[in-house]
């Protein structure tokens, strides 16, 4: 059939909950480009139809939930206007009940499953949550060894879980936990995450760069909406939290109630000896208050700050 | 259960690169940190370097500029190369992970180890 | 570089002793890590986390220790652990090694 087969690593899964994967091969898929899902090489594609159990949604394939007998090699083929690509994924289900036995007797588990927290430095945990656009997630609830994680020391930042001053004692099993909404049912997403710990700096203690902002004021007018990013070069290893704060609080909480400023979801774009790194502040509406205030991007030990500023007059 | 196997030539000549691969099964080397570490005859054990999860290399400083540490997350396998040689580098060679009980900095797998001789 | 001075170098005692191992850094470290080797053999994992023992290593040895002076304790030696101990710190690189202790017996 001319299709150029190209074999992914396997996934390993867990049975009674939501799963997608995405049909991306960059640069395949960058140009116009026809995808369709098949399951275990049968000519039948996979559904289109949003209230079948398992269907494709634009490029994903979506389980909802994933089933034990849904164990086997997925296909997509991706054919463009002069080639045909075939990716092979295989999915293995399992029935996992994370309170009950340790995701330690589990060695070919995802790497997103496993991460490591660095002794005595601020570090993060990511619940890696992948769905299509109709997938609407709700807010992610952390738990360690099955019970719900409390304590100053741990703060929700979007899919992260931030960890300040981690301890020997943070190594362990995590599980994050979500809501997910799809055509106005909901499902439980629950990731189990084994968390080990390292005294290695890992990033050979460098410094993160902070290409944007550069310690300057940007002129917007009073009620407008600003969005402003901030780009970070940093090495692949490492370990360091990028967020927003405003008066030394994350912006997300110093705004909680109103939520009028908020941060976006970080984005990173790979390169061969580093990372660059976005995450963006968004003004809803620009108010009185926020003028002559710093809103400081912080990554790791760097920081740099923007202050908004009323445009001068003009009297043309 | 993860085993760590070193292979590669047991004699290498002064000047020339001793190069070792470790094949690591039971564990996927996009996960951890995968270290060398040798063992002088009659002397201490001494840290190489290691390459992390995200191919990111540390090297001891006494060593760093003749140690190359690199891997095939293909074959599963990471490697040592050691250039200009010298019978000072005669030792035990070994590779080793961490995990055990969640810390990565315990190195709790080791190969079995092989002997380089450096002469001519 | 932080370097790791174990004490003593080696040591005769008989079994059923009490034997301590010393190992002291010249910088503050965060934790310990204790090997047990055999001649001609691999090293072992012998305690991790300055405290914490290995799997299948006797609950006579003990670890101890922090900031610069770290112990390792064999309550009563037995013949199986007549070996060499190294300690090794991971808190700033270069990670290094003690230079060893052969315990042998008298």
């Known amino acids: 059939d001319g299709c150029k087969d190209i074999f992914m690593k396997n996934e390993i899964l867990s049975a009674s909950q939501p799963f997608a994967f995405n049909c991306t091969f960059p640069p395949i898929t960058s140009g116009e480009v026809s995808v369709t899902w098949y399951k275990n090489s049968s000519k039948i594609p996979v559904s289109k139809i949003i209230q079948s159990r398992i269907h494709q949604d634009e490029t994903w394939i979506l389980f909802l939930p994933m089933e034990w007998g849904d164990s086997g090699v997925y296909q997509c083929v991706i054919k463009g206007r002069d080639s045909c690509h075939r990716i092979h994924v295989n999915l293995t289900v399992f029935e996992k009940h994370w309170c009950d036995t340790s995701i330690g007797g589990l060695p070919n588990l995802s790497d997103e499953y496993k991460q490591i927290l660095h002794l005595g430095k601020d570090d993060s945990l990511t619940c890696h949550l992948h769905f299509p656009k109709s997938c609407v997630l709700g807010p992610i609830k952390w738990y360690k060894d099955c019970n719900e994680i409390k304590g100053e020391r741990f703060t929700v930042l979007e899919t992260r879980l931030l960890v300040s001053n981690v301890s020997a004692e943070d190594r362990g099993n995590y599980a994050c936990q979500a809501i997910l909404t799809h055509s106005g049912k909901q499902y439980e997403v629950l990731n189990g995450i084994t968390v080990s710990i390292t005294e290695r700096a890992g990033y050979g203690g460098s410094v993160p760069k902070i290409i944007y902002p550069k310690n300057h004021s940007i002129e917007v007018q009073l009620g407008t909406t600003l969005i402003v990013d901030c780009n970070v070069t940093d090495t692949k290893d490492n370990t360091n939290l990028r967020c927003w704060r405003v008066n030394n609080t994350l912006v997300d909480d110093y705004y909680d109630e109103s939520k009028r400023i908020r941060e976006g979801v970080e984005t990173h774009v790979s390169f061969r000896e580093h990372n660059l790194y976005t995450v963006n502040i968004t003004f809803l509406e620009v108010k009185m208050e926020d003028y002559g205030l710093p809103f400081m991007c912080h990554a790791g030990v760097s920081t740099a700050y923007i202050i908004l500023q009323l445009p001068a007059p003009d009297f043309r | 259960q993860v085993q760590l196997q070193e292979s590669g030539p047991g004699l290498v000549k002064p000047s020339q690169t001793l190069s070792l691969t470790c094949t690591v099964s039971?564990?996927?080397?996009?996960?951890g940190y995968w270290n060398w570490i040798r063992n002088h005859p009659g002397k201490g054990l001494e840290y190489i370097?290691?390459?992390?999860?995200?191919?990111?290399?540390y090297y001891n400083p006494s060593l760093k500029s003749r140690v190359t540490i690199s891997r095939d997350t293909s074959k599963n396998q990471f490697s040592l190369k050691l250039s200009s040689v010298t019978a000072a580098d005669t030792a035990v060679y070994y590779c080793?992970?961490?995990?055990?009980?969640?810390?990565?900095?315990?190195?709790?797998?080791w190969g079995q180890g092989t002997l380089v001789t450096v002469s001519s | 570089d932080i370097q790791m001075t174990q004490s003593p170098s080696s040591l005769s005692a008989s079994v059923g002793d009490r034997v301590t191992i010393t190992c002291r850094a010249s910088s503050n470290v965060r934790y310990m890590y204790w090997y047990q080797q055999k001649p001609g053999k691999a090293p072992k994992l012998w305690i991790y986390l300055t405290s914490n023992l290995a799997s299948g290593v006797p609950s006579r040895f003990s670890g101890s220790g922090s900031g610069t002076s770290y112990t390792l304790t064999i309550s009563s030696l037995q013949p199986e652990d007549f070996a060499t101990y190294y300690c090794?710190?991971?808190?700033?690189?270069?990670?290094?090694f003690g230079q060893g202790t052969k315990l042998e017996i008298k």
């Open positions: 080793a992970t961490g995990g055990y009980d969640y810390v990565e900095d315990a190195l709790y797998y």
């Open positions: 370097g290691y390459i992390s999860y995200s191919g990111y290399t």
């Open positions: 090794q710190q991971f808190t700033t690189s270069p990670y290094t």
């Open positions: 039971g564990a996927s080397i996009t996960s």
